[in-house]
Structure formats: C-alpha cells, structure tokens
Interface confidence: low
C-alpha cells in the first residue's frame, strides 16, 4: 500500500522536511504533489512525468520544493504556513490512479526564556512571590526547576496561567533557592538563567553562648549572641536592663561578684522591623563552692529508667570529676558523660548501679569532693526460688520450704497449695506429712513499689514408693559438633541414688560425657550423630527402684558433601539425563539444582529427556538443612557428544 512518511514529523521553522514515499507502484506514468488532503489543481505543488523526467511547478509551488525520481518531496526553509497535509497523486502506466496523504507539523525554535518576579525581597510567613516565565509562546509547555530539581509537591506552590506562572504562598527561608523555568515544544527546549529568591526573615530568638552561667571571680566574661536573620541582625547588650553596647559580643575582663545579674541580648532586623531578645542569668562566685550532686530520678526502676546525675554548681572553665564505688568511672556503654563532664547519665539502670557516686571540682590547688550519693534502684521481684530443691518426700517427715526473690524494696511472700492461699510468710512449714500433702506448691513474691509479682510453682510428691522417673533435656534437637545437651533425671528426691544407661549399657567412659548434680544430670558435650541413642535414667533408695522410659536423642547434622549418581560424565546426544543427588543429613535436606549457574527445580532427581550438546555444562547439586542452617554443594561437568562422534559414551538413564 502506498504510504507517505514525514521525516521528521515535527519540523522546526527554517529547517527542511522530507516526505518519503513507501511502496511506490511499478510501471508509472508520473506523479503529482498537492497541498492538502485531496487532489486539487489549484493546490498543486509540482508534477513529474517519468518518461520525460520533467518536473512542472504548480500553483502552490513556492520554490522551496524539490521532487525526486522516487516521488519523495523535499521542502526546504520551512515556514509556519507549511504545517498540514500533503497528498501524492500517482498515475500508473495503465492510467489507474493511486493516492496517499502524509502530514507534518511546524513549530518555532523557542527563544531562551527569562523569569520575572513580582517581589524581589519577600518577607517570611507574610509575602507571596509570583514568578512568570517570559515570553508567552503558543504551543509551548512550561516547566519549573528548583535547585535543578523538579518542583516538590507542596500546598504552598501553585502553578497557573498554563504553568507559565509559579506562585509561592507564605514564603519561608527554606524557599531561598535557585529557580529556573523551561519552555518546550516538539522541536526545542530552552532553560532560563537562575533567579535566586532572597527571603527576608528573622531575627529568630537569639542564642547566647557559652551556655554556662556560673563563673569564678577574676575570670573574663565573654558572651556571644547569634540570631538567624536575613539580612544579618544588629545586636545590643543590656545588663540588668541597662544598655551596654551595640555589638554581637560582650566582653568584661576580670569579673567580680558585682557582675552577677541578668544579661540580655537584643537582635534587630532593619528590613523586617522585628526585634527578639534572650536573657541569661550570670552568677559570679567569690570562690569555688563545695560541689553537690542532683539527680533527675531518686527511685529509678531497673531496666526502665535512665538517671542523670549532675554536679552543681555550673562553673566556667572547671574540670569535673566522677567516682563510682570510690573508683574512677569504669568504661561502659551505659555510662555517658556530657561534653563538659558535669552530667553523668546511667542508661537503663540496673540493681548494680546503686553507687555510691561522688563528683569533684578541680581547682588550682586541690579537688573539692561532693558528699556521696547512693541510688535507690527499684527492681524485682525476680522469679522466686524455692528451697530445698527436692520434689519427692517420704511420709512422716517434716516439709520445710523457704522462698526467696531478689527485690527492692524486699518482696512480700505468699504461699499457695493447689491454688489455695495458705499464709503470707517467707517460710512454709508442715510437720509429719502424708500422701495428702502432695500437690502444687506456689510461692508468690510481690514488690509493693513496682506493683510487680512473680511466682514459682513446685510439685511436691509424698509417697513411700519411688515414682517412675523421667528425663528432661535442655535441647531437644542439638546440632552436631556445636551443641551440648544436658539430660536431668526427674524428680529430685531425698536420699536417692541416680543411675544412667545408654542403649541398655552403663555409661561408657568418655571425656564428652559428664555426670553432675549428684549424678542427676548427664551432660554430653559437642554432640555427634553417633550420640543419637536411647538414654534411660534410674532412681533407687532403700525401699524401691525405678527406671525412666528411654529418650532418644535427635542429633541434627549435615548436610554432608553430596554425591551425584550415576558417576558418568559423558553422554550421547538423544540419551535421557537422570541425575540423583544424595547427602547425609538430619533432617533430610532440601535439594536444588543449577545448570551453568541457572536455578532449576527443587528435587533430589534432575531429569532431562533427549539431551543434546546444548545440555553440556556444569550441573551443581545444592543441599541445605534449614534446621542446622548449613549448606553444601557439589558440581559435576556433563559432556554431551553428537551421536556416534565418540566411542565409549554412556547411553544415559
């Protein structure tokens, strides 16, 4: 099909455009170009007869058009009026006509824009500023840049007038920036020079430095004042309300007690007409006073509160020192000193942080010490412990249980048996116990200051016969070569002997096996997969003996280095590749394959039917044991030869 392509479609004024003809039919008599979407003799630009190779201008010919033998039309020195449609009329040798229409659009080359502003010195939080991008150009798009970034989203920024005007409402000092505008049309884009917005602001409340307010007699007083302001602020100093001088710094040498008082700095901005003041009270000491410690929290709660200890008074050019437990401060991430060493902060206090704490002020001759301060750290109660630890008693003996929980203030204790309150004492005594005294014995410890309570429950069994023991373990799934396992034979009983068996045999002698706690606890250090055996404990006294059920240790191990089978590495084209991967592991590992580094499936067997030389490469089996967190892998190179090219190749699976 005859088509016209405009190259380019969007043309800049003064440039040229080529109306390129595609799929021109064979056996042509000639062709003619027309301005517009139809054949109109009054709008003919140029005609061309192939036989004579003669081009004839038409009424719409401007002298800027060139027609080529392939029917394409070049228009030079494009003007705005050239925008629109162009129709090619082709006359074939059989005098059958064909037409095609193309078009292009003409745009002006944009001039460099500039920015005009309605307010060159806006005042912060008061004025608005409107920037306008000049000149106004038809069919142009306007863009804005702030510090060479596109406009941020802000309710104070508003575009109007077809984006030609950018308004900043309620300007702030942060609007002080470089602003540019850009004009764009399909053929050009131009940016303006920067306009820097100069926002008048301030003065803010001045700050007086240094911050310290205590000085010694004979020192120099040197105060400096600063307030954020544009233009920069003018400063005045007043002492006890009396004007001193119009400078940013106030200097008084060799001060005395009489220089104590209120010092005021006033900052003034002549453009905004605003004033702001700040007052500091200066105290001049005749001689260094005895220091003392103030605390922001006299009863801090353990693991919750921080405590800031401050050495008073604040004196300029003084060295502050601290001691804890009559020692210099230990290095600890929980101890922080302020820049001037005057404040010691204990982050997240513990019961061990009680002190005593002392601070000192160093002068030329000696160090003045404060009185010691002790922190009253509230803590606990911790989980109470019930002693003795026996859980098994014979009838007729006395039961005497004691409860203790670390706590400040000291805990209040209550005893419950099978959930029923018995007494509010630290000790529980029952004489001449019987089987009826078996039950759940609960000690409850309460801290009245923190309101916290903690309980511990102990099972007491009163019986003439020893119970069937059981084995508790501190680690049900230990990892090989990493973990230790402690088996404990329950219950703990008075006057009882504890025995152990492994796979029905008495304990082997091994440096990795250790008995403790009156043989009640058996510890296996650095377990191996060979420790996955049946463990039994036994208890006996003069009346009876009993054995636990066996506990089998489930040792997690692996994955070991995997093995890929079959071992063949050479295959014939067309064979099936069936690789199986195996790794010793507990639990069974997850398998995955990669071919030439590319992940395949998560299966133990990799099967590829009818392999070709394209299947050459490295086949890696990856094994991972999520329980041990360990991984392993092996790589095998597979070579596939075209059938019959190499003798002795495996036919595959």
């Amino acid at each position: 099909k005859l088509t016209i392509e405009s190259t380019p479609f969007n043309v800049a004024e003064g440039k040229e455009v080529l109306l390129l003809v595609h799929n021109l039919p064979q056996h042509l008599f000639g062709y003619s170009w027309y301005k517009g979407e139809r054949v109109d003799g009054n709008r003919q630009i140029i005609g061309y007869v192939i036989g004579t190779q003669q081009a004839t201008p038409g009424p719409a010919y401007s002298g800027r058009e060139i027609i080529y033998p392939n029917a394409s039309l070049l228009i030079q020195n494009i003007i705005q009026n050239d925008t629109g449609f162009y129709t090619l009329h082709v006359i074939k040798s059989d005098l059958v006509n064909e037409e095609a229409t193309g078009q292009f659009r003409v745009y002006p080359e944009l001039p460099k824009p500039s920015i005009s502003s309605n307010n060159s010195k806006p005042v912060e939080d008061k004025d608005a500023v409107a920037f306008t991008c000049e000149p106004e150009t038809q069919d142009a798009t306007y863009l804005w840049w702030v510090n060479n970034q596109s406009l941020p989203v802000s309710p104070r920024l508003q575009l109007s007038n077809g984006n030609r005007t950018l308004t900043l409402f309620n300007v702030t000092r942060n609007d002080t920036a470089s602003y540019k505008c850009e004009t764009q049309n399909p053929v050009s884009a131009r940016r303006s020079d920067s306009v820097i917005l100069n926002v008048l602001y301030g003065p803010d409340a001045p700050t007086i430095s240094p911050l310290n307010t205590s000085y010694r007699s004979g020192e120099n007083l040197n105060l400096s004042c600063h307030a954020a302001s544009n233009p920069p602020a003018q400063y005045s100093w007043f002492v006890n309300g009396t004007f001193q001088q119009s400078t940013q710094e106030l200097f008084i040498p060799n001060i005395t007690v009489n220089n104590s008082g209120s010092y005021t700095c006033q900052a003034h901005n002549s453009d905004t007409g605003l004033n702001r003041t700040t007052v500091t009270t200066i105290t001049v000491y005749a001689e260094p006073p005895k220091p003392f410690i103030t605390s922001n929290n006299s009863n801090p709660v353990e693991d919750e509160d921080a405590v800031a200890l401050t050495c008073e008074p604040e004196i300029q050019n003084t060295t502050y020192l601290w001691w804890v437990n009559n020692q210099s401060l230990p290095v600890s991430p929980r101890l922080q000193l302020s820049n001037d060493n005057r404040t010691l902060t204990l982050l997240s206090v513990t019961r061990n942080d009680v002190g005593p704490y002392e601070c000192g002020i160093q002068n030329e001759l000696s160090v003045d010490h404060s009185d010691p301060v002790i922190l009253n750290v509230l803590y606990g109660p911790d989980d109470p412990t019930i002693s003795p630890s026996y859980t098994y008693y014979r009838p007729g003996v006395n039961l005497s249980l004691s409860c203790h929980a670390a706590s400040n203030p000291p805990a209040q204790y209550s005893w419950l048996i099978d959930g029923n309150i018995q007494q509010h004492t630290q000790e529980l005594f029952i004489s001449n116990i019987t089987e009826k005294n078996s039950g759940l014995y609960t000690c409850q410890a309460n801290n009245s200051a923190s309101g916290h309570s903690r309980t511990t429950v102990k099972t007491i069994t009163v019986s003439a016969e020893l119970p069937k023991p059981s084995i508790s373990s501190n680690n049900s799934k230990p990892v090989e070569d990493k973990d230790a396992v402690a088996f404990t034979c329950e219950p703990e009983a008075q006057n009882t002997t504890y025995l152990w068996w492994v796979n029905g045999q008495s304990l082997p002698v091994s440096p990795r096996l250790q008995l403790s706690n009156g043989n009640r606890t058996l510890t296996l250090f650095n377990v191996t997969r060979n420790d996955a055996r049946a463990y039994v404990c036994g208890i006996q006294n003069s009346v009876s003996a009993n054995r636990s059920d066996p506990v089998t240790l489930d040792v997690l191990y692996g994955p070991d280095t995997p093995i890929i089978s079959p071992p063949d590495s050479s295959y014939l084209s067309g064979a099936n590749l069936n690789l199986s991967c195996h790794s010793a592991s507990n639990p069974s590992p997850q398998y995955s394959w990669r071919i030439n580094g590319i992940p395949q499936q998560h299966t133990q067997v990799l099967f590829i039917a009818k392999i070709t030389p394209n299947n050459n490469g490295t086949y890696a089996c990856f094994v991972s044991n999520l329980a041990t967190g360990r991984n392993n892998s092996i790589v095998k190179s597979i070579t596939v030869s075209a059938s019959g090219t190499s003798p002795g190749l495996s036919a595959g699976a």
């Epitope: 590319i598 395949q600 499936q601 998560h602 099967f607 590829i608 039917a609």
Partner: antibody, heavy 124, light 110 residues
Framework: QVQLQESGPGLVRPSQTLSLTCTAS????????MHWVRQPPGRGLEWIGW????????EYAPKFQGRVTMLVDTSKNQFSLRLSSVTAADTAVYYC?????????????????WGQGSLVTVSS | DIQMTQSPSSLSASVGDRVTITCRAS??????????MHWYQQTPGKAPKLLIY???NLQSGVPSRFSGSGSGTDYTFTISSLQPEDIATYYC????????FGQGTKLQIT
C-alpha cells in the same frame, strides 16, 4: 510444602501507596524469580513485574513503570510490592507467584505456584 | 508488548463434549525450539492453576483430558471430554518477552 502467602491492608485511600508482602515457605526464594500479578474484579489477569531476590534486580510492566517498587527480605524469605498514587482502577486481587518449581524444563516465566490472593480495595 | 487475543470470550458445552479455545499472539512467541505459551484454569475465588506449559506440556497432576498445541503465533487448548469440574475461566499467557495474559474464556456447562 511449597507455599506463598500474601498479606497487607485490604483498604487503601486514593493517592496513597498500596503495600503487600508475600511470605514463601518450603523453598528458598533466592533460587527463583518472584512475580506479582493482579486481577481487577470480574476482569482478566495483569502481570505487574518480577524481582530476583538474589540481587534485588527488578523488571516491571510498562503500564506500572514509575509507580511500582518491589523489595526483598531474604532473611525472612519474603518479598513485597509497593504501588504508589493508587486510584479506584487499582482495586484488584493481588497475587504473588513464581515459576516452574515442579516442572522439569527450565524456561521463562510461567507460574505454577501462586498465593491465595489478597483483595485490595482503593476507596475513600 | 506482545498482545494476546483469546477466543471465544465465553462458551457453553455439554458434559462429554470436546472443547477448544484458541489464542493468537501479535507476533511469534516461539524461540530456541520452545513455544512460550502456557494455559491456566481459574475457578471463582481461587488463584489460577497451571495446566499446560510450553504449548503442549501437561503439568504434573493435571488430568490427561487437557492438552495444548501450536507454534509461532497460533495456539490451541483442548478439553477432550468436558467434565462438570471443568467449569472455570481459562487463560493463555505468553512468556516470550514480558508476560501478558489473554483476556480469558469463561466455560459453562449447558
């Protein structure tokens, strides 16, 4: 077994950002490209994009380019989808999925493991 | 983007009927000896389920009455003997470039 599970808020306000997380179990996401697909109510399936958890590389459908971000947390075996400046047209069931966990042939994206889907409604 | 045109958009058939759905890609989705066309089944309220991958491969666990064929731009999905549980919407999907799905075919039983 191999599973994917989407989670996130069911209601998002217009112009806000839609955030969903997909948690994988039974396999390691670092071995696979992980995808998001959505389905507006009563309409067909639309592929949104993929992330390679091994290196964080992403590729998004042109339709979502500029609004979509996909992130990964391999320590939790999770990946996530963030779609900004949402409108009512973003109301859909969002699925996370992955390709070819159970198939023998390696190829580009087809999806045989899908989450159950998470309906997200965009409304004020 | 490669556009997918799936037809018909809906169809009704009886139990035991042979059902065919076609999918045409705007350009070839075959390369390197593979045809990157896949077929899914989606029942209401559920996630799509892969039935056929790479034009003709039956996904593990999918009944053998489902099959697929085709290469280049034209692909066909067939259910040889329609069962009541096959009521669903079926989608084709290519993966030659960034994935796109067909608009779906809703299958009902008369």
């Amino acid at each position: 077994q191999v599973q994917l599970q989407e989670s996130g808020p069911g209601l998002v306000r217009p112009s806000q950002t839609l955030s969903l997380t997909c948690t994988a179990s039974g396999f390691n996401i670092k071995d696979y490209y992980m995808h998001w697909v959505r389905q507006p109510p009563g309409r067909g399936l639309e592929w949104i994009g993929w992330i390679d958890p091994e290196n964080g590389d992403t590729e998004y459908a042109p339709k979502f380019q500029g609004r979509v971000t996909m992130l990964v947390d391999t320590s939790k075996n999770q990946f996530s989808l963030r779609l900004s400046s949402v409108t009512a047209a973003d109301t859909a069931v969002y699925y996370c999925n992955t390709r070819g966990l159970s198939t023998m042939i390696t190829t580009r994206w087809f999806f045989d493991v899908w989450g159950q889907g998470s309906l997200v409604t965009v409304s004020s | 983007d490669i556009q997918m045109t799936q037809s018909p958009s809906s169809l009704s058939a009886s139990v035991g009927d042979r059902v065919t759905i076609t999918c045409r890609a705007s350009k070839s989705v075959s390369a390197s000896g593979y045809s990157y066309m896949h077929w899914y089944q989606q029942t209401p309220g559920k996630a799509p389920k892969l039935l056929i991958y790479l034009a003709s491969n039956l996904q593990s666990g999918v009944p053998s009455r489902f099959s697929g064929s085709g290469s280049g731009t034209d692909y066909t999905f067939t259910i040889s003997s329609l069962q009541p549980e096959d009521i669903a919407t079926y989608y084709c999907q290519h993966s030659r470039e960034l994935p796109t799905f067909g608009q779906g075919t809703k299958l009902q039983i008369t």
